[in-house]
């Protein structure tokens, strides 16, 4: 990896699993305010693999609420707006960090945590499955 | 909000900006160790609304590699393999979280940070847009 | 014209599985998805599931995810329903319909959970 | 999933008159970008299968008589029966095809008064 010279004004830690553990700062930095996806773009809904959005709330992780994607249909709309059964909705998933708290229920002290999310669909070209 | 009752076994934080600042464990915790999108699916190939995944990255962040989504095309891809420029190929973007080294090559400090990632691309119906 | 012909009535005990089948006839099988739908003595009807013909790809009802399977074989025009760890609830008449909305459906298949 | 609600349970009707049964759903079954309501209706008779009436909550299937006529957008849709003829007492089902599971309304029955 890159070597990065460290800066003497650094907080010092004392913390025996150091560098496992680290101070992070709540305060976001490029927060947008925006956090309803359903008002940031109607992609969802004019899409060829619409899709819904469903709110998944866990206050023992930050961020609290993530929205979770979920394909309306097996196929996608096709120009007449029937499902095309000859091609798929699929779902775009990415991996994201999320703070766990860690202990349970303390306000100050959390575990990185990755999970994959759903974050909207796509129309594929199936793969087709042949008969044994 | 939800009110957690909190556990008596949690760290002690003497921080004057408590709860701003909290002690966060970089061992992930739902590791998943396939990282790059383009070995966890091939729909980026196979969408009606195809994308280039670049490597972004920044080892002043955390994670320091991160893959962005480009569309290939302004349209989306027909049942012939053509360009139809009546549809509209556009990114689906994820607002996701980031720690930030603050202070800059800090190796044990951290600030969040949330930035807006593009993870696929997916094929819309246009809004069309009438000469008055 | 377009036939769908299912496969006769079945009984069966508590925990048994049942594979009913839906030819298909009259036009080009894998052109339209095939769905399932059920409906028990003097109910409504219940949508199970659908299969793309084509690819084989399916979209299941979370109600009955892990119990059924639906499957296709396009050299003899045929889909396939099956129904594992079957209940007494279970009991009703399956249905295969053509097409996005139902536009033909099979004379339908009576399955009675009975011990 | 989407909560289909069919009204009234029974409609008792003599030939001749005019039917009108309502659905409504949880939530929207317009598509806002093709201006479509994903919504079916089903007519069903004793030992028979269900048979397609109208689709896109207003499109009649090829073959059905147009004295079957759809309405409405969104959440509210009914089905209406300009003059019924005989043949037409049976359960009549509506469904949302806007997002799976594809789920009907528990049916309407119109019977000879």
């Known amino acids: 990896g890159i070597t990065i010279p460290r800066n003497p004004g650094c907080p010092n830690s004392e913390d025996k699993n150091f560098p496992r553990t680290v101070m992070v700062n709540l305060n976001i930095h490029n927060r947008n305010t925006n956090t309803n996806p359903k008002r940031s773009s109607d992609y969802y809904n004019r899409s060829t693999s619409p899709w819904n959005l469903h709110r998944n709330e866990d206050p023992e992780r930050y961020p609290s609420v993530i929205w979770e994607a979920k394909c309306r249909h097996l196929g996608c709309i096709n120009a007449d707006g029937n499902v095309d059964y000859h091609m798929n909705s699929v779902p775009i998933q990415q991996e994201i960090l999320v703070l766990r708290r860690e202990p349970p229920h303390c306000p100050n002290s959390f575990r990185l945590e990755k999970i994959l999310v759903s974050v909207g669909c796509t129309c594929v070209t199936p793969i087709v499955h042949h008969v044994a | 909000g939800i009110t957690i009752p909190r556990n008596p076994g949690c760290p002690n934080s003497e921080d004057k900006n408590f709860p701003r600042t909290v002690m966060v464990n970089l061992n992930i915790h739902n590791r998943n160790t396939n990282t790059n999108p383009k070995r966890s699916s091939d729909y980026y190939n196979r969408s009606t609304s195809p994308w280039n995944l670049h490597r972004n990255e920044d080892p002043e962040r955390y994670p320091s590699v991160i893959w962005e989504a480009k569309c290939r095309h302004l349209g989306c891809i027909n049942a012939d393999g053509n360009v139809d420029y009546h549809m509209n190929s556009v990114p689906i973007q994820q607002e996701i979280l980031v720690l930030r080294r603050e202070p800059p090559h800090c190796p044990n400090s951290f600030r969040l940070e949330k930035i807006l990632v593009s993870v696929g691309c997916t094929c819309v119906t246009p809004i069309v847009h009438h000469v008055a | 014209q377009v036939q769908l012909v299912q496969s006769g009535a079945e009984v069966k005990k508590p925990g048994a599985s049942v594979k009913v089948s839906c030819k298909a006839s009259g036009y080009t099988f894998t052109d339209y998805a095939m769905h399932w739908v059920r409906q028990a003595p003097g109910q409504g009807l219940e949508w199970m599931g659908v299969?793309?013909?084509?690819?084989?790809?399916?979209n299941y009802n979370q109600k009955f995810k892990g119990r059924v399977t639906m499957t296709r074989d396009t050299s003899i025009s045929t889909a396939y329903m099956e129904l594992s760890r079957l209940r007494s609830d279970d009991t009703a008449v399956y249905y295969c319909?053509?097409?996005?909305?139902?536009?033909?459906w099979g004379q339908g298949t009576l399955v009675t959970v009975s011990s | 999933e989407i909560v289909m609600t069919q009204s009234p349970g029974t409609l008792s009707l003599s030939p001749g008159e005019r039917a009108t049964l309502s659905c409504k759903s949880s939530q929207s079954l317009l598509n806002s970008s093709n201006q479509k309501n994903y919504l079916a209706w089903y007519q069903q008779k004793p030992g028979q299968a269900p048979r397609l009436l109208i689709y896109?909550?207003?499109t009649r299937e090829s073959g059905i008589p147009d004295r079957f006529s759809g309405s409405g957008s969104g959440t509210d849709f009914t089905l209406t029966i300009s003059r019924l003829e005989p043949e037409d007492f049976a359960v009549y089902y509506c469904q949302q095809h806007y997002s799976t599971p594809y789920t009907f309304g528990q049916g309407t029955k119109v019977e000879i008064k």
């Open positions: 299969i793309s013909t084509y690819s084989g790809n399916t």
């Open positions: 319909a053509r097409g996005n909305y139902g536009s033909d």
């Open positions: 896109f909550a207003s």
